[in-house]
């Protein structure tokens, strides 16, 4: 019986050009976490294997950094990064737990209004 629950950062927002940390935490189970996969739709962003460490998919290598912990850091955000992200916990003997995070990337207020500000 699967007793665990996943807590996530839920719905989050970040500015275009900035970075964001995606975090999930599995609790209420003694199951062994063998691997955590980070995904966006049908794209695999990264795998964190308990024994072998991190693998960042080549498509995302320049904009994704492992950690902190089992989390994932997305860098140089664009509005196209807006959407659902999933953390998939592969555990033994429980099986698979899935957490969902919705990220909204906003136009930078600094970028929009920066020209209005002048240094005296």
């Amino acid at each position: 019986m699967m007793t665990g629950t996943i807590e996530t950062t839920g719905n989050i927002s970040a500015e275009k050009g900035g970075s964001i940390i995606l975090q999930c935490h599995l609790s209420s189970t003694t199951a062994q976490v063998t691997q955590v996969n980070w995904e966006q739709q049908d794209q695999l962003l990264a795998i964190c294997n308990a024994d072998l460490g991190w693998h960042i998919s080549p498509s995302f290598k320049d904009r994704v950094a492992p950690g902190p912990g089992l989390g994932l850091t997305l860098q140089s955000l664009t509005v196209n990064d807006t959407g659902e992200y999933f953390c998939i916990y592969h555990t033994y003997p429980d099986g698979t737990y899935t957490g969902r995070i919705f990220l909204e990337v906003l136009e930078s207020s600094v970028a929009e209004h920066g020209a209005r500000f002048q240094i005296p």
Partner: antibody, heavy 120, light 107 residues
Framework: EVQLQESGPGLVKPSETLSLTCAVS????????WNWIRQPPGKKLEWIGY???????YYNPSLKSRVTISRDTSKNQFSLKLSSVTAADTAVYYC??????????????WGQGTTVTVSS | DIVMTQTPLSLSVTPGQPASISCKAS??????VAWYQQKPGQSPQLMIY???YRYTGVPDRFSGSGSGTDFTLKISRVEAEDVGVYYC?????????FGGGTKVEIK
Amino acid sequence: EVQLQESGPGLVKPSETLSLTCAVSGYSITSDSWNWIRQPPGKKLEWIGYISYSGNTYYNPSLKSRVTISRDTSKNQFSLKLSSVTAADTAVYYCARLDFSNYGGAVDYWGQGTTVTVSS
Amino acid sequence: DIVMTQTPLSLSVTPGQPASISCKASQNVRTAVAWYQQKPGQSPQLMIYSASYRYTGVPDRFSGSGSGTDFTLKISRVEAEDVGVYYCQQYYTTPWTFGGGTKVEIK
């Protein structure tokens, strides 16, 4: 250039233990993941398991109760033991390296393979 | 375990013509798929990883595509040296599993 060379008896009696060793040259087994994969005649390749850079092991659940993978870092080699063998364990056995960071679970270096027959 | 099913079982191709091999996963594996070539009398060699990325030294006539459950390995112009058995593999989750192989022959 990474090179892997399997060695061990080509004939094993039923109910006995199959023992193979893989000698690695050109690379330290204290980095990356070191795997055993087999191919029974006319069947699919089957991943047996790995020993990681830190010495952690993971075994295919279908073989877990019979498999032991160990290593000798002083000799830069790793070994496979498969107990209670039957004719179904007759196969070509490959040792292989996996660079998880760069290629995920894709195996980038293979030994030449050694044929093991289980027969009385 | 995730089952990888390859089609066709074998393929006979005229040199210079294209070839296509299909691999279907029993569940969604996103892009965690590799392809290997095994020439007669040799061990398998990595060709494609992450579904579409060519491994070092692999000729650009080889290409991989797909995501989710359906994957394809294409050879744009088959050469005599391409004969052998091609395998797909998923590494979305352990135990990592392989397809049954597709034998490519030259007409």
